[in-house]
Interface confidence: low
């Protein structure tokens, strides 16, 4: 069991790398990478290590959420002397190694980004030959996924005393601003609850009392775009319906 140091590198500028007489373990990752939902992103990660001529078996790992304990999203293994890192795990098939671990590069490409990919990622390398050693970035790289607004739910619900209320939930990053418009409303921000805990990209706006029949429109907007959806209230016809 070889005791190795923990990387506390916050960014590329404060990385200590001692080039002589021997390298120590260090990992270089940027603090943050930004990309838009639906696009691809590259998570850079390079490292130095003290085992100058190591060409034994190695494993490259990326995990999400937290170092050491977070779930693995990517893992590949290279046999002794090989520069081919054979993928053993790629969550949903969307993660692919861009770098060459033999050349101290663990950079990862993430395809078809979704808002759920917005989290911190940690790279790790393990040597498992005559040298047995491993190292993992402690702070990792934050993948910041941006997205134009999308209304995920719009509905009319009964309230006490035969009244109705409308709810609109949208997602986006930055979290979108929501506004309701409709009969006798003008343009109203209504009661906006945002963002929901554990659902950082979701914003909900409520119209607590619908006083008139007709079409109620929810508009979600952020710096990347806007989205609209409507519900129709037919109170006197015994039905309420939604049309998006």
């Amino acid at each position: 069991f070889v005791r190795t140091k923990i990387d506390t590198t916050e960014n590329l500028l404060n990385t200590e790398v001692h080039s002589s007489p021997a390298q120590r373990w260090s990992m270089q990752v940027p603090p943050e990478v930004s990309a838009e939902a639906g696009d691809a992103a590259v998570l850079p990660c390079t490292f130095t290590h003290p085992h100058r001529h190591y060409d034994g078996p190695l494993t490259a790992i990326w995990r999400a959420g937290e170092p050491y304990a977070g779930p693995q999203v990517f893992r590949c293994a290279a046999a002794r002397g090989s520069e081919l890192c054979q993928t053993a795990l790629s969550l949903h098939g969307r993660f692919r190694l861009l770098g060459n671990p033999r050349r101290n590069d663990l950079s990862l490409r993430v395809e078809r980004l979704a808002l759920a990919d917005d989290r911190r990622y940690f790279c790790r390398v393990e040597f498992a030959g005559d040298v047995h050693d491993r190292y993992e970035s402690r702070h990792g790289v934050r993948l910041h996924v941006t997205a134009a607004p999308r209304i995920v739910n719009i509905s009319v619900l009964p309230s006490p005393a035969h009244a109705f209320r409308a709810l609109c939930t949208a997602e986006g990053e930055p979290p979108p601003a929501l506004a309701w418009s409709g009969p006798a409303l003008g343009n109203s921000l209504a009661a906006v609850r945002s963002p929901r805990e554990g659902h950082g990209h979701l914003v909900t706006a409520e119209l607590p009392a619908l006083t008139h029949d007709g079409r109620y429109t929810c508009t979600a907007a952020n710096s990347l775009g806007r989205s609209e959806a409507s519900v129709y209230l037919f109170r006197f016809h015994g039905a309420s319906g939604a049309s998006t």
């Epitope: 923990i6 506390t8 304990a69 779930p71 693995q72």
Partner: antibody, heavy 118, light 112 residues
Framework: QVQVQQPGAELVKPGASVKLSCKAS????????MHWVKQRPGQGLEWIGL????????NYNEKFNTKATLTVDKSSSTAYMQLSSLTSEDSAVYYC???????????WGQGTTLTVSS | DIVMTQAAFSNPVTLGTSASISCRSS???????????LYWYLQKPGQSPQLLIY???NLASGVPDRFSSSGSGTDFTLRISRVEAEDVGVYYC?????????FGGGTKLEIK
């Protein structure tokens, strides 16, 4: 060699505050998290919280949120824990421990015995 | 919080024989990455705790191979194959799967 040093004892009055120190040597102080652990007389171990010396980020056991404040002085490679509004319940041995590779506690200080008494 | 449970005392053991100490967690410490986040520490009388085992089954640096550990996700056993006088103390299991990190109440190893 790695060493984590703590003063042996502190005697303070109820209601007062105390700042316990933990001096690290023999390794790069900013490369490992520092944890604090409480042990009441004849009892088990309780994790108080941790601090990352590179950026002073902290994480506390909720139970100690209002009791303990963790800080570091990078220039002297020293971690500190301030305990406030002391009562007899705070009388205990307080250990600092370095967080190793997987964030287990690989090097422990000798502990500071805190006695809260009037 | 994850609760770690241990018996306060072990069955008294004779020097040179083997001893077992058990620990149970309220939640599985086996992560999907294959690592079990269970640790064993020994606190000898009048001393600070010291790390014995990390991630359920790995011997810490400098710890004699008389010590070994095994278990499932929630039930764990520390074994000492040939107990020596210097092994006396309180053995704590601990988890760092989740914050806050938690310890068992400790098991005191008793010598006959």
């Amino acid at each position: 060699q790695v060493q984590v040093q703590q003063p042996g004892a502190e005697l303070v009055k109820p209601g007062a505050s105390v700042k316990l120190s933990c001096k690290a040597s023999g390794y790069t102080f900013t490369s490992y998290w520092m944890h604090w652990v409480k042990q009441r007389p004849g009892q088990g171990l309780e994790w108080i919280g941790l601090i990352n010396p590179s950026n002073a980020r902290t994480n506390y056991n909720e139970k100690f949120n209002t009791k303990a404040t963790l800080t570091v002085d990078k220039s002297s490679s020293t971690a500190y824990m301030q305990l406030s509004s002391l009562t007899s319940e705070d009388s205990a041995v307080y250990y600092c421990a370095r967080g190793g590779d997987g964030d287990y506690f690989d090097y422990w200080g000798q502990g500071t015995t805190l006695t809260v008494s009037s | 919080d994850i609760v770690m449970t241990q018996a306060a005392f072990s069955n008294p053991v004779t020097l040179g024989t083997s001893a077992s100490i058990s620990c149970r967690s309220s939640k599985s410490l086996l992560h999907s990455n294959g690592i079990t986040y269970l640790y064993w520490y020994l606190q000898k009388p009048g001393q600070s705790p010291q790390l014995l085992i990390y991630q359920m089954s790995n011997l810490a640096s400098g710890v004699p191979d008389r010590f070994s550990s095994s278990g499932s996700g929630t039930d764990f056993t520390l074994r000492i194959s040939r107990v020596e006088a210097e092994d006396v103390g309180v053995y704590y299991c601990a988890q760092n799967l989740e914050l806050p990190y938690t310890f068992g109440g400790g098991t005191k190893l008793e010598i006959k």
